[in-house]
Every structure is written in structure tokens, then in C-alpha cells.
């Protein structure tokens, strides 16, 4: 790391080290030999999240409802607004600038992880012994019915998309 002319939280201007403005404040005027750095708080809709020498604060992100966005966390003078997606939608990217509907898991697949405002549905194939016969963003793979516990026998084997079909046992009379 190259040497720096100033302390942490300072910057060099006119061969002198001046204090940076703290998060939530912007630079109005540099320090002089006789005066300290002058800083002003960011306005209601603005923020700065680091020690800085910015002359303008950044605008808070706008969570556009037309893009399926809503406010998850309101911005402060030191933090940006955090957007998330409306119910049934998730962010297209990490910056969450727009939303897309959650995908459904097709028959033969179940939901491994339900979607959130920031992540899509995660599907998994139904393993042997389980099935899903619906297209759903919520349903997990369900276990095949146990015919034995109902005193029935398997009449038709189950698949990853269908349950077993149970039927009565053939009773042979003596």
C-alpha cells in the first residue's frame, strides 16, 4: 500500500490535511490553517455512507411499484433505501432494480426452497418414494401413499409425478 500524506479520515488539499466529513454529511468548504472542514447534513431524501469529501449527497434509491418494487428499509442520511419485491416476485439482480415472478416447480419436481423477495424458487427432482403432480411455487415433493398402513396393496406403482394406487387385497377363500 503506498504511503499516505494524511491520517485516516483526512484528505490532502492545498498541501494540508483536512478532516473528511462524516457519513451523513457533505463537504461545504475545505479546512484552512485557521478553520476546520465545514460539512453539512444531507437532506431528507439523500445520503452519504462513508467518510467523504463529496460536495453532493447521493439520492436515495426509488423503489418503483411499476417494476414490482417496494421499500424494505427506508434510507437515512447515512444509508441508501433498500428495495425488495412485492409478494410473488423476486429481484432480477443483486441491486434489485426490477422484479420477476417466482418460478413454479413442474410436476415431478418439488420446492426445495421457497422464493423470497430477493431469491427465486429452488426446485428439486422428486426422489424415489416421492411425487409431485402439480406445478407449484410452494409444494414440496410428497411421499407416496403407504398402502400397507391402510391394509391395502399397491395396484399401480407410483412415479415422480403420480402417487401409488392402492386397492383391496385379493382374499382367497379356503
Amino acid at each position: 500500500e503506498p504511503p499516505t500524506a494524511c491520517r485516516e479520515k483526512q484528505y490532502l488539499i492545498n498541501s494540508q490535511c483536512c478532516s473528511l466529513c462524516q457519513p451523513g454529511q457533505k463537504l461545504v468548504s475545505d479546512c484552512t490553517e485557521f478553520t476546520e472542514t465545514e460539512c453539512l447534513p444531507c437532506s431528507e431524501s439523500e445520503f452519504l455512507d462513508t467518510w467523504n469529501r463529496e460536495t453532493r449527497c447521493h439520492q436515495h434509491k426509488y423503489c418503483d411499484p411499476n417494476l414490482g418494487l417496494r421499500v424494505q428499509q427506508k434510507g437515512t442520511s447515512e444509508t441508501d433505501t433498500i428495495c425488495t419485491c412485492e409478494e410473488g416476485l423476486h429481484c432480477m439482480s443483486e441491486s434489485c432494480e426490477s422484479c420477476v415472478p417466482h418460478r413454479s416447480c413442474l410436476p415431478g419436481f418439488g420446492v426445495k426452497q421457497i422464493a423470497t423477495g430477493v431469491s427465486d424458487t429452488i426446485c428439486e427432482p422428486c426422489p424415489v418414494g416421492f411425487f409431485s403432480n402439480v406445478s407449484s411455487a410452494f409444494e414440496k415433493c410428497r411421499p407416496w401413499t403407504s398402502c400397507e398402513t391402510k391394509d391395502l396393496v399397491v395396484q399401480q406403482a407410483g412415479t415422480n409425478k403420480t402417487d401409488v394406487v392402492c386397492g383391496p387385497q385379493d382374499r382367497q377363500r379356503a
Epitope: 498541501s15 478532516s19 479546512c31 484552512t32 476546520e36
Partner: antibody
């Protein structure tokens, strides 16, 4: 009362490394930058760099870049200065020195040393 | 880097004399200057900072002045314990730099 106690004298061969310690007491260790200054026999004072014990941030003089490492252990209020690839002209007394409190300074770096360690003589000789 | 030039490099004086040491910076450093006293085998001792502020516990016979590039340390009436080497140090920007030192010797 404030005290900076340094490790003992060292004799090293050229090419070797030396690590000098500086144990602070009597004040909040993380509230003040710690600097290292050296003085060759019969010569003046030469600033080597600083460490911010709170953040662990460092700043080294260009002359020592790549050869010096300053570290700290806040649990025992101790700062360390390690100098590698020693040469005979590194023979000097090495001092740790306490700066003004963090936040004291608004303009200038205003690094003035009100407390010094007793010094550690490092002799580099083949 | 900012060069600090001290003069004279040595001065011979007697107890009770007024002694003046000057320090010149290669570029303006506002008032960011300190003076130290060092005795043989000892660490330096801070006398004055921000060019003219006396460090706590330092006798009032020591005073500092100057701003920009030219600075002065004055010992108004030299005492036996004042025979030592004096260093100026700029504290405007890193790297910190020291003057070459002025040795105050007994005449």
C-alpha cells in the same frame, strides 16, 4: 502514568529480520496512533511510520515500504515493528512514540510525540 | 517530502545566555511544528508543539514562534540542564520529517 516499555537490544546478521515490541500502559491503547522513529549512532531522528491500534491501519515512510511491518495486539496493549532484510546501515536505536489522541486533529496531521519508549538498540553486523 | 533545515548545527553558550535556534521548512507547514530536546542515551522530550504551545511541565524559559516556513526556538536564560540536542519536526503531512539537530554545548 503513561509508559511505553520496549523489548531488549538485538544483534542481527545482514539479511535477517528483527521484531521490536512496545508495551503500552497507563492509557487507552486504541485511542492513540503509535509511531516508530529510529536514530542511527550519532545521527538525527528518522520517522518510519505509524499504526492506528484501533483499526490496525498503517502508513510507512517510502524508504521502508516493503521492508517494514507494523502490527499490534490490543489484548496486551502492545505494538510491534518488524524490519526485514537488515543491512548494516539499519544499526540504530528504534523508538516507539505515542501520538496525540484520535480525533484531536482536524487540520494537519499534527503528530507530536508526548511519550516515547526507552529505545531498543538493534545492531546489524556480520 | 518536506525538508527541515536547522541552524546552527551547534552552538556554544554559557548559563544565563539567550539561545535562539531556527528551523526552515522546504514548503509551508502552517504552524504544524514541534521542538524536542534530547540528552545522550535518552529518548527525545517534547518541548513545544503547534509552533508555540508549551508542552505541560516544560519550563517557561522555552518559547517557540513562527509560521509557514520559518520557525524559532528560544531559550531565554540557559540553565545547566538545557545542554542537549534540539530537534524540530514538521507535523503538517506524512512522512514526518525532523531537522538535523542543534547541539547546545557549554562554552
Amino acid at each position: 502514568q503513561v509508559q511505553l516499555v520496549q523489548s531488549g537490544a538485538e544483534v542481527k546478521k545482514p539479511g535477517a529480520s528483527v521484531k521490536v515490541s512496545c508495551k503500552a500502559s497507563g492509557y487507552t491503547f486504541t485511542g492513540y496512533y503509535m509511531h516508530w522513529v529510529r536514530q542511527a549512532p550519532g545521527q538525527g531522528l528518522e520517522w518510519m511510520g505509524w499504526i492506528n491500534p484501533d483499526s490496525g491501519g498503517t502508513n510507512y515512510a517510502q524508504k521502508f515500504q516493503g521492508r517494514v511491518t507494523m502490527t499490534r495486539d490490543t489484548s496486551i496493549s502492545t505494538a510491534y515493528m518488524e524490519l526485514n532484510r537488515l543491512r548494516s546501515d539499519d544499526t540504530a536505536v528504534y523508538y516507539c512514540a505515542r501520538d496525540q489522541p484520535l480525533g484531536y486533529c482536524t487540520n494537519g496531521v499534527c503528530s507530536y510525540f508526548d511519550y516515547w519508549g526507552q529505545g531498543t538498540l538493534v545492531t546489524v553486523s556480520s | 517530502d518536506i525538508q527541515m533545515t536547522q541552524s546552527p548545527s551547534s552552538v556554544s553558550a554559557s548559563v544565563g545566555d539567550r539561545v535562539t535556534i531556527t528551523c526552515r521548512a522546504s514548503q509551508g507547514i502552517y504552524s504544524w511544528l514541534a521542538w524536542y530536546q534530547q540528552k545522550p542515551g535518552k529518548a527525545p522530550n517534547l518541548l513545544i508543539y503547534t509552533a508555540s504551545t508549551l508542552q505541560s511541565g516544560v519550563p517557561s524559559r522555552f518559547s517557540g514562534s513562527g509560521s509557514g516556513t520559518d520557525f524559532t526556538l528560544t531559550i531565554s536564560s540557559l540553565q545547566p540542564e538545557d545542554f542537549a540536542t534540539y530537534y524540530c519536526q514538521q507535523a503538517n503531512i506524512f512522512p514526518l520529517t525532523f531537522g538535523g539537530g542543534t547541539k547546545v554545548e557549554i562554552k
